[in-house]
């Protein structure tokens, strides 16, 4: 399941790069798969929010990106996530790259990267 989600994630990142005009030399944070969920590309100063993944959900390749961004740009018809919701994790895109997830997955979602590897 996670291999499939990772593959879908990479496809989604590629589509997002095209839509947002991102390339390897663009400033900002590249989209990434962090072994738990998929993070879309982001501009410096953007905060990206994601919902805790449903660990055993089969990814739907046609679904919209399940994130909400705060900053210069939004992507697609994203869900209206808010840090005041439970089960939401954020990362900031900084000049040094992505920040650590906050809260950590283990405290926001009840599981961590080690569980997703098994």
């Amino acid at each position: 399941i996670f291999k499939k989600e990772q593959a879908m994630c990479l496809e989604k990142i590629q589509r997002a790069n095209e839509l947002m005009g991102f390339n390897d030399s663009s400033p900002g944070c590249p989209g990434m798969w962090d072994n738990i969920t998929c993070w879309k590309p982001a501009h410096v100063g953007e905060m990206v929010l994601v919902s805790c993944p449903e660990l055993f959900r089969i990814f739907n390749p046609d679904q919209v990106w399940e994130t909400e961004t705060i900053g210069e740009s939004d992507f697609g018809d994203s869900n209206s996530l808010d840090l005041s919701d439970m089960g939401v994790v954020s990362r900031n895109c900084t000049e040094d790259g992505w920040s650590e997830p906050f809260p950590h997955y283990f405290d926001a979602c009840g599981f961590d990267e080690y569980e997703s590897e098994t």
Epitope: L83, D85, M86, V88, F102, P103, H104, D107, A108, G110
Partner: antibody, heavy 123, light 107 residues
């Protein structure tokens, strides 16, 4: 029914190491759905979370910054128990120490606690 | 660290009263908040988790509400066994800090 039974000395000399053990019955320290925590309560009644250990394919520990340089929480899978070691204690470490199980249901909460051990740091 | 501020620090009430205890977080913690009751010489006991969910076995006169930074614990029709100290605790991000406690005693 989950029960946590604490053991360890009630008096520790300054600069020495505080060691307490929490024996688990009705659950396993290797459970992949629980965390195992230590909390203390100072004489002023203030509760302070010290840290936790848990198993998810591998063992992980999280510690409070206030004690991070001095604390170790170790699981003992053979006895289904976990321990607290706090090094270089001072009288400010005098407190009632509790072990507790963390359970996940939308968030982590502490649903089963040990009976508490009063530890006095004094020469 | 996230600071948890509880008020009042103590209150006096009578059996049958409705009381409210408040807890404020130094930053938004969504609903990652728990309430515990502690009686002298005993360990804390979980009452409410996720701000408003009643722990199994806890009487329905206990209720919790709130989200973000402001939370309340309400006890409807206070019973003799409810005279105790109450603590809030955030589990949004370690270290999982507690409020200073509210002692409820008999008027």
């Amino acid at each position: 029914q989950v029960q946590l039974q604490q053991s360890g000395p009630g008096l520790v000399k300054p600069s020495q190491t505080l060691s307490l053990t929490c024996a688990i019955s009705g659950d396993s320290v290797s459970s992949n759905s629980a965390t195992w925590n230590w909390i203390r309560q100072s004489p002023s009644r203030k509760l302070e979370w010290l840290g936790r250990t848990y198993y998810r394919s591998k063992w992980s520990n999280h510690y409070a910054v206030s004690v991070k340089s001095r604390i170790t929480i170790n699981p003992d899978t053979s006895k289904s128990q976990f321990s607290l070691q706090l090094n270089s204690v001072t009288p400010e470490d005098t407190a009632v120490y509790y072990c507790a199980r963390g359970t996940w249901k939308q968030l982590w909460f502490l649903d089963h606690w040990g009976q508490g051990t009063l530890v006095t740091v004094s020469s | 660290d996230i600071q948890m501020t509880q008020s009042p620090s103590s209150l006096s009430a009578s059996v049958g009263d409705r009381i409210t205890i408040t807890c404020r977080a130094s930053q938004s913690i969504s609903r990652y908040l728990n309430w515990y009751q502690q009686k002298p010489g005993k360990a804390p006991k979980l009452l409410i988790y996720a701000a408003s969910s009643l722990q199994s076995g806890i009487p329905s006169r206990f209720s919790g509400s709130g989200s973000g930074t402001d939370f309340t614990l309400t006890i409807n029709s206070l019973q003799p066994e409810d005279f105790a100290t109450y603590f809030c605790q955030q589990s949004y991000s370690p270290p999982f800090t507690f409020g200073e406690g509210t002692k409820v005693d008999i008027k």
